[in-house]
């Protein structure tokens, strides 16, 4: 009776997430292998977030508009292992757009989602950032590795959204 | 008083190639990003090109992208267009600009008189 | 690209009366409650000239008489009471996303 029930919540739930997502990539996780937990389809999944790469370029705002239809942000990184895990399916000539920005140009990043900027935790290129002008983040590969560059907000470059992962 | 002064404009045959300059007063050149932007005769505005105030990033539109480069000299106060493989429709008044962040967008808040440039045989 | 639409494509207003222009973009140029057009004004054998900013915005310098609004896709520059020095080639302008684009022009003359 309890897995009966766990069942119907659960296809009631996905029922639920299939209006937004078309389909989703659910895996087993938790003590007992109980909880799935989910990601739309074809997004990549690292710990608890969902990350898409759009390669349609656009201006930060808009790259935010366009998360934010799907559910998502502009990607906050947070950790070393959560950006190697992100740049392994970037292309190496590219530039994409962070959920990162300082818009009075005042040298106050700040992340879409209100996380507190930690000047510890940033992987900004040598010399960066370098121009109160700039003010959106990307991440570029240059001089032979991953970080970030202060750019104009209005050139359009592709961008990185990251969701919650969907637990159901 | 801020004074942007364009030179370099002419008269030259289509697939050759110019060079503007855009001399500044009055501001600190360094700190500012630049812009190109140009008016053909009778026309409306077209911007043609930006580069940071650092001199490392560049933007174009794609119709002159590939055939056009903007630079500058801060140590000179001078911004530059070189323009190559012209065409009859890059006729026009070309005008630099500085400019200023809203945000994240911008505005071109001060503006040179212009150089004239004719394509023409 | 984003396309800047002006109307009308010239006017005639009497001294001292209303003039009014209006702007459409193609799409949003909104974000986080600011609006990315701006206005500028061309006087015969000048360069363009800033007049308004962020939509709504006035720039320093630049008389009161003059006031933009409107957000999303739709902007109107006014000018409550128009002075002979106001003959000109007015611009409106996107900044949210290269390449910026302007409209067509407005010209306006005294009636």
């Known amino acids: 009776n309890f897995m009966y029930s766990k069942t119907v919540k659960r296809l009631s739930k996905l029922q639920e997430y299939q209006q937004y997502y078309p389909s989703l990539t659910c895996v087993m996780e938790g003590k007992d292998m109980e909880d799935w937990s989910c990601c739309p389809t074809p997004w990549t999944s690292f710990q608890s977030s969902c990350y898409f790469i759009s390669t349609v370029m656009q201006s930060w705002t808009k790259s935010q508009n366009n998360c934010s239809v799907m559910g998502a942000d502009l990607v906050v990184i947070n950790t070393k292992e959560e950006q190697d895990f992100i740049t392994q399916n970037l292309k190496i000539n590219s530039a994409y757009f962070l959920g990162l920005s300082d818009p009075k140009g005042w040298r106050h990043w700040q992340w879409v989602d209100q996380t507190p900027y930690n000047k510890n935790v940033t992987f900004w290129h040598s010399g960066e950032p370098n121009s109160p002008d700039e003010r959106c983040a990307i991440i570029n590969f240059r001089s032979e590795e991953w970080g970030w560059n202060d750019v104009h907000c209005h050139v359009p470059q592709k961008s990185i959204c990251k969701m919650k992962k969907i637990y159901i | 008083e801020v004074q942007l002064l364009e030179s370099g404009g002419g008269l030259v045959q289509p697939g050759g190639s110019l060079r503007l300059s855009c001399a500044a007063s009055?501001?600190?050149?360094?700190?500012?990003?630049m812009s190109w932007v140009r008016q053909a005769p009778g026309k409306g505005l077209e911007w043609v090109a930006t580069i940071n105030s650092g001199g490392d990033n560049t933007y174009y539109p794609d119709s002159v992208k590939g055939r056009f480069t903007i630079s500058r000299d801060n140590s000179k106060n001078t911004l530059y267009l070189q323009m190559n493989s012209l065409r009859a429709e890059d006729t026009a008044v070309y005008y630099c600009?500085?400019?200023?962040?809203?945000?994240?967008?911008?505005?071109?808040?001060?503006w040179g008189q212009g150089t004239t440039v004719t394509v023409s045989s | 690209d984003i396309v800047m639409t002006q109307s009308p494509d010239s006017l005639a207003v009497s001294l001292g009366e209303r003039a009014t222009i209006n702007c459409k973009a193609s799409?949003?140029?909104?974000?986080?409650?600011?609006?990315?057009v701006n206005w500028y004004q061309q006087k015969p054998g000048q360069p363009p000239k800033l007049l308004i900013y962020g939509a709504s915005n006035l720039e320093s310098g630049i008389p009161d008489r003059f006031s933009g609004s409107g957000s999303g896709t739709d902007f109107t520059l006014t000018i409550s009471s128009l002075q002979a020095e106001d003959v000109a080639v007015y611009y409106c302008?996107?900044?949210?996303?290269?390449?910026?684009?302007f409209g067509g022009g407005t010209k306006v003359e005294i009636k």
């Open positions: 600009a500085t400019y200023r962040p809203y945000y994240y967008g911008s505005v071109l808040d001060y």
């Open positions: 799409q949003s140029v909104d974000y986080d409650g600011n609006s990315y």
């Open positions: 009055g501001i600190t050149f360094s700190t500012y990003t």
């Open positions: 302008q996107q900044s949210d996303e290269d390449p910026w684009t």
